[in-house]
């Protein structure tokens, strides 16, 4: 079997809301993946599990099941959303994200994603990690691949 390539493209959008009493930030982060099937047979994308970390704390998790199948030598682009919560233990972040006097409210998040594919009863997992900037001060829609140059660190594969 040839490889199945997973490429994390970046953040597609980040929608933010706040709870002032709880000093809590809610970020719905939509990410984009490219999955390429280099085989001469179809593969199933069984599930995608993702988590987001801020300052080494997991702030969000998501799991998508029975997503799609990818035909031979084909590529599919998949969007997945991770709801994240920056809670009161990090209440200093609430002030940072909501202060009008700060023009750019970018925070660094670590995006982790694992794609599980199956073919002929065989299962394979491919994982990616990427640090990204996300604006926690406003709703933001990024151009596809725009977040690529926002990377502050890309761990060695």
């Amino acid at each position: 079997p040839r490889s199945i390539d997973v490429k994390y493209i970046g953040v597609k959008s980040a929608y933010v809301s706040y709870d002032v009493q709880k000093r809590t930030i809610y970020l719905n982060i939509t990410n984009t993946l490219n999955i390429t099937n280099n085989n001469y047979y179809s593969v199933e994308v069984e599930n995608i599990t993702a988590q987001v970390q801020f300052a080494k704390t997991v702030i969000g998790k998501a799991r998508l099941n029975n997503i799609t199948h990818i035909g031979p030598l084909d590529m599919k682009q998949i969007d997945y959303t991770v709801p994240t919560v920056i809670a009161e233990e990090m209440s200093y972040m609430y002030d940072f994200c909501t202060l009008i006097s700060i023009k750019v409210h970018n925070i660094v998040l670590m995006m982790q994603v694992t794609v599980t594919t199956t073919y002929f009863g065989h299962s394979e997992q491919i994982s990616q990690e990427r640090y990204q900037y996300v604006d926690c001060g406003r709703n933001t829609t990024y151009q596809l691949g725009q977040s690529e140059y926002l990377n502050v660190l890309q761990p060695q594969q």
Epitope: D19, V20, Q21, S91, Y92, Y94, T98
Partner: antibody
Framework: QVTLKESGPGILQPSQTLSLTCSFS??????????VSWIRKPSGKGLEWLAH???????RYNLFLKSRLTVSKDTSSNQVFLMITSVDTTDTATYYC????????????WGQGTSLTVSS | QIILTQSPAIMSASLGEEITLTCSAS?????VHWYQQKSGASPKLLIY???NLASGVPSRFSGSGSGTFYSLTISSVEAEDAADYYC????????FGGGTKLEMK
């Protein structure tokens, strides 16, 4: 019209448990973003925040008093409760409940207060 | 926990005088709120979000500040302003300042 009214025992002996009730009207504690706090004022001293309960039953407590405090609510009867265990003379104070309006972080309405004396 | 230190603890003012009460935070915060408590009464919201006047509060009251330093100014003190004044923050946990007692000369 928003009103809050506190009630309590008035006098307790040291080591007893204090139970306070805040009865309110003019708003619902099931409304998203609402909250009610308990605050006290010992005679001759400043205000001290004790506990807060949110519309979704989430709670916050004063760090230094956390082990002795329990806040709860009965949404259907428009009441919030505060329990303080093992009271001593330093708990002698006027106790207030105050409303924090929807998506606000300040107290826009206060009760009239209920006085507690802890004495043996 | 953030400590709010109010000064002076007691202030005497003459009618018509302009006075400023201060509130200093042990860490930088976004804003503070101010409450007035008259003798025998419950506290009343005076100013929210550092500088916004609460409903029904006379315009002689004003608030300002940022970071770790905040102040409440009464432009022309009236007899009915004799009270305790408290600053309050909800940014990092929740605390009130120790209060300033305003007396009339």
């Amino acid at each position: 019209q928003v009103t809050l009214k506190e009630s309590g025992p008035g006098i307790l002996q040291p080591s007893q448990t204090l139970s306070l009730t805040c009865s309110f009207s003019g708003f619902s504690l099931s409304t998203s973003g609402m909250g009610v706090s308990w605050i006290r004022k010992p005679s001759g001293k400043g205000l001290e925040w004790l506990a807060h309960i949110f519309w979704d039953d989430d709670k916050r407590y004063n760090l230094f008093l956390k082990s002795r405090l329990t806040v709860s609510k009965d949404t259907s009867s428009n009441q919030v409760f505060l329990m303080i265990t093992s009271v001593d003379t330093t708990d002698t104070a006027t106790y207030y409940c105050a409303r924090m309006g929807r998506q606000r972080d300040y107290f826009d309405y206060w009760g009239q207060g209920t006085s507690l004396t802890v004495s043996s | 926990q953030i400590i709010l230190t109010q000064s002076p603890a007691i202030m005497s003012a003459s009618l018509g005088e302009e006075i400023t009460l201060t509130c200093s935070a042990s860490l930088s915060i976004s804003y503070v709120h101010w409450y007035q408590q008259k003798s025998g009464a419950s506290p009343k919201l005076l100013i929210y979000g550092t500088s916004n006047l609460a409903s029904g509060v006379p315009s002689r009251f004003s608030g300002s500040g940022s970071g770790t330093f905040y102040s409440l100014t009464i432009s022309s003190v009236e007899a009915e302003d004799a009270a305790d004044y408290y600053c309050h923050q909800w940014s990092i946990y929740r605390t009130f300042g120790g209060g300033t007692k305003l007396e009339m000369k």
